[in-house]
Interface confidence: medium
C-alpha cells in the first residue's frame, strides 16, 4: 500500500512568497514623481517579481514631532488622495498582489512613537487600523517597535483588531534589535505576528555562524511562521558586500517562512554607488536616466532594465527563485533540516513528505571547498541521495539540470548551490 | 475608596498548585489594570504579571509556564493561579492597581495587604 | 529583559540628613520610572512615578530625578516617618522588574 500523504498545513498568502516594501515612495520611482498613482503604473513590474505582498509607506498625514499634526486616516497629499490609493487596491488585488500599509506613526520625526504621549498614538492607531482595515488593505507595518513603550501588549491588541476583521489579514512588527531575547519576548504574547529585525545582519558573513544564527532562531521560535530579512527597512547593500548578495537572496528564499524584501534588493541597489543620495532610501535605479546628478555614474547593469535583457543578473535570479519559492512544496511550507558540510559552509534540507525535496548550498568564504556533506547529521525521513540535479547556482558556468554527485561536491568562492532530488521510500 | 482584598489558602503543599483571588471595589477592572508582586520574607519585590482592562495579560517570562492571571469583569474579581510550587516560592502575594497600558502615568497606586 | 540596579543595599542616617538612592537601569527606560517606600510588615506604598512626578499625599521632602538608565530618588531633612525600605521598578516593558531595594536605618 501506498504510504499515506501528510495533511497540507493551512497557508495564508503570506506564507507563499516574499513581500516587497516601498518604504519611500518618491524614491521608488524617481524623477520628481512618487504618488500612488505613480505607483499603480509600476505593479506590472512587481508582478514579475512574483511578490506576494507588497509594503507601503508610511504615507499618512505627519508633521514632523507634532502629534496633534499627525493623521493615520489621512494620506499625504504629497502621494495622492485617498480615491488613488483606493485606485492602487483595486489594480494590486487584480495582479493577486496584496497590499500592506506603513503605520509607524512619527516617521518623518526623532521618535517615531512620540514617547510622551502614548494613549494618544495608541488611541490613533486603533482608529486608523479599524478605519483602514474597511478601506481594504490586507496587513499593517509598524516599525521601530523598540521605541513604543509596552510594545508587546500593543502588538496583542492591534493583532486582535486585525485577526478579528479577518484571519488573514497580517500585522508586521519591525524593530532594529539584532537580540534574540529581546526579539522573543516581542513574539512570546504575539502568535502570529510577524517581525522584521536586525537579527541576520549580525551574521559576519561567515558560514559557521549564519547557521548557527538560522538554527538558533528557528529552534527557538518553534513552529511558529518567521519572517527573514536583514532589517526592518534597510537595503541588503547596507550590510553585504556584493559578492554575498546572490547568496543571501537564495538563503532567503529558501529559509522556512516569509522572505521580505525593501525595494531595489533585487538589482544591488547601493546608496553608495550614488554620490548624494540618502542610504535608507536611495533612488531606484529603473534605468541608466534615473539618476541623472552624475553623468556616467550609473551603467546599464546597475538598472532594471539591463538586468532584466541579462539572464545571468541578479534580477533575474531574483526572479527565478521567487518562482520556484511560490511554487514548490517543499519550499512553501516544508520541513527544514540543517547539516554540517565543512568550515565556511552553510547547508541545508527542505522537505515535505512525498514532494520533490531541495538541497542548498552555501559557501560564504571567498576561497572554493569542497564540501563534505554529512548526511549522518540528517534524520532518516531527510537522507541525502548519492545525486542531485542542479536547478541552479548563484554563479554563471554550470550546466543547469545535471545531476551532480554530492560526495564530489565542489563550490566556488561566494557560491551557492540550489538541487534537486526526489522523495525515495 | 480604592480596596484590593485577597483570598487564597496561606498553605500549600510541595508540587501542589496555588489559587489567590484579588477583589477589589472603588474602581473597575475596565478601567485599571492589576499587577500581581511577591515578596519572599526578608527579600525584594518580584513582579509576576498583569491583567490590563481589555483582557491582555503580561508575565514574568522566568514564570510564564507556571503562571496564570485571569478576571471577571462583572465580579471585580482577577485571580492569580500557579502551578507546581516549591518552597522557594514562600512570599508574601500582592495584587496592586495600575494604570491601563495607554497611559503615560504608571505606577501601582493602590496594594493589597498581602 | 530589563535588569535594575538599586544602591546603596543599606544606608544608615540621621533624623534631619539628606539621602539619596539612586537606581540604574540595563536599557534605555525613557523615564518611566516608579519608587515605592515600604514600611516593615505593610505593604508597599507609591511615592514617585514617571521618574520625577510626586504621588498624591507624598511629601515635598522627596524628590525623584535622571532619565536613560540613570535614576535618582533624593530625601531632604529625613523625617522619622521615612525610614524603611526602598524600591525602584520600571514601567518600560514587560517583565516590570523592581530594583533589589534599598534599607534605610536610623543611625
Known amino acids: 500500500r501506498a504510504p499515506r500523504c501528510r495533511e497540507l498545513p493551512a497557508q495564508k498568502w503570506w506564507h507563499t512568497g516574499a513581500l516587497y516594501r516601498i518604504g519611500d515612495l518618491q524614491a521608488f520611482q524617481g524623477h520628481g514623481a512618487g504618488n500612488l498613482a505613480g505607483l499603480k503604473g509600476r505593479l506590472d513590474y512587481l508582478s514579475s517579481l512574483k511578490v506576494k505582498g507588497l509594503v507601503l509607506g508610511p504615507i499618512h498625514k505627519n508633521q514632523k514631532d507634532d502629534v496633534a499634526q499627525t493623521d493615520l486616516l489621512q494620506i499625504d497629499p504629497n502621494f495622492g488622495s485617498k480615491e488613488d490609493f483606493d485606485s492602487l487596491l483595486q489594480s494590486a488585488k487584480k495582479k493577486s498582489i496584496r497590499v500592506i500599509l506603513d503605520l509607524t506613526p512619527n516617521y518623518r520625526g526623532e521618535n517615531s512613537w512620540f514617547s510622551t504621549q502614548v494613549d494618544t498614538v495608541a488611541t490613533k492607531v486603533k482608529d486608523a487600523l479599524e478605519f483602514w482595515l474597511q478601506a481594504g488593505v490586507d496587513g499593517f507595518q509598524v516599525r521601530d517597535i523598540e521605541n513604543l513603550k509596552d510594545a508587546s501588549s500593543f502588538l496583542a491588541e492591534w493583532q486582535n483588531i486585525t485577526k478579528g476583521f479577518s484571519e488573514d489579514r497580517l500585522l508586521i512588527a519591525g524593530t532594529n534589535s539584532s537580540d534574540l531575547q529581546q526579539i522573543l519576548s516581542l513574539l512570546e504574547s504575539n502568535k502570529d505576528l510577524l517581525l522584521t529585525s536586525s537579527y541576520l545582519s549580525d551574521s559576519g558573513s561567515t558560514g559557521e555562524h549564519t547557521k548557527s544564527l538560522v538554527t538558533q532562531y528557528l529552534n527557538a521560535t518553534g513552529n511558529r511562521w518567521c519572517s527573514w530579512s536583514l532589517s526592518q527597512a534597510r537595503l541588503l547593500t547596507s550590510f553585504l558586500p556584493a559578492q554575498l548578495l546572490r547568496l543571501y537572496q537564495l538563503m532567503l528564499f529558501t529559509l522556512p517562512g516569509t522572505p521580505v524584501f525593501s525595494y531595489g534588493d533585487e538589482i544591488g541597489l547601493d546608496a553608495a554607488a550614488l554620490p548624494g543620495q540618502p542610504m535608507e532610501a536611495p533612488v531606484m535605479l529603473w534605468d541608466e536616466s534615473s539618476f541623472p546628478d552624475i553623468p556616467g555614474a550609473v551603467s546599464a547593469n546597475m538598472t532594471v532594465k539591463g538586468q532584466s535583457e541579462d539572464p545571468g543578473s541578479l534580477l533575474s535570479l531574483f526572479r527565478r527563485l521567487s518562482d520556484q519559492r511560490s511554487k514548490e512544496r517543499s519550499l512553501l511550507h516544508g520541513d527544514f533540516h540543517a547539516f554540517s558540510a565543512g568550515p565556511g559552509l552553510f547547508s541545508y534540507i527542505r522537505h515535505w513528505d512525498q514532494n520533490e525535496r531541495f538541497l542548498v548550498v552555501l559557501n560564504f568564504g571567498d576561497v572554493g571547498l569542497s564540501a563534505g556533506l554529512q548526511a549522518s547529521d540528517l534524520p532518516a525521513s531527510a537522507s541525502l541521495p548519492a545525486k542531485a540535479d542542479l536547478l541552479l547556482s548563484t554563479q554563471p558556468g554550470r550546466e543547469e539540470g545535471s545531476p551532480l554527485e554530492l560526495e564530489r561536491l565542489k563550490l566556488e568562492p561566494h557560491e551557492g548551490l540550489l538541487l534537486r532530488f526526489p522523495y525515495a521510500a | 475608596q480604592v480596596q484590593l482584598k485577597e483570598s487564597g489558602p496561606g498553605l500549600v503543599a510541595p508540587s501542589q498548585s496555588l489559587s489567590i483571588t484579588c477583589t477589589v471595589s472603588?474602581?473597575?477592572?475596565?478601567?485599571?489594570?492589576v499587577h500581581w508582586v511577591r515578596q519572599p520574607p526578608g527579600k525584594g519585590l518580584e513582579w509576576l504579571g498583569v491583567?490590563?482592562?481589555?483582557?491582555?495579560?503580561n508575565y514574568n517570562s522566568a514564570l510564564m509556564s507556571r503562571l496564570s492571571i485571569s478576571k471577571d469583569n462583572s465580579k471585580s474579581q482577577v485571580f492569580l493561579k500557579m502551578n507546581s510550587l516549591q518552597t522557594d516560592d514562600t512570599a508574601m502575594y500582592y495584587c496592586a492597581r495600575g494604570g491601563h497600558y495607554g497611559s503615560t502615568s504608571y505606577a501601582m497606586d493602590f496594594w493589597s495587604q498581602g | 529583559d530589563i535588569q535594575m540596579t538599586q544602591s546603596p543595599a543599606s544606608l544608615s542616617a540621621s533624623v534631619g540628613e539628606t539621602v539619596t538612592i539612586t537606581c540604574r537601569a540595563s536599557?534605555?527606560?525613557?523615564?518611566?520610572l516608579t519608587w515605592y517606600q515600604q514600611k516593615q510588615g505593610k505593604s508597599p506604598q507609591l511615592l514617585v512615578y514617571t521618574a520625577k512626578t510626586l504621588a498624591d499625599g507624598v511629601p515635598s521632602r522627596f524628590s525623584g530625578s535622571g532619565s536613560g538608565t540613570q535614576y535618582s530618588l533624593k530625601i531632604n531633612s529625613l523625617q522619622p516617618e521615612d525610614f524603611g525600605s526602598y524600591y525602584c521598578?520600571?514601567?518600560?516593558?514587560?517583565?516590570?522588574?523592581f530594583g533589589g531595594g534599598t534599607k534605610l536605618e536610623i543611625k
Open positions: 472603588g474602581f473597575s477592572l475596565t478601567t485599571y489594570g
Open positions: 536599557g534605555n527606560i525613557h523615564n518611566y
Open positions: 491583567m490590563w482592562t481589555n483582557g491582555i495579560t
Open positions: 521598578q520600571h514601567f518600560w516593558n514587560t517583565p516590570y522588574t
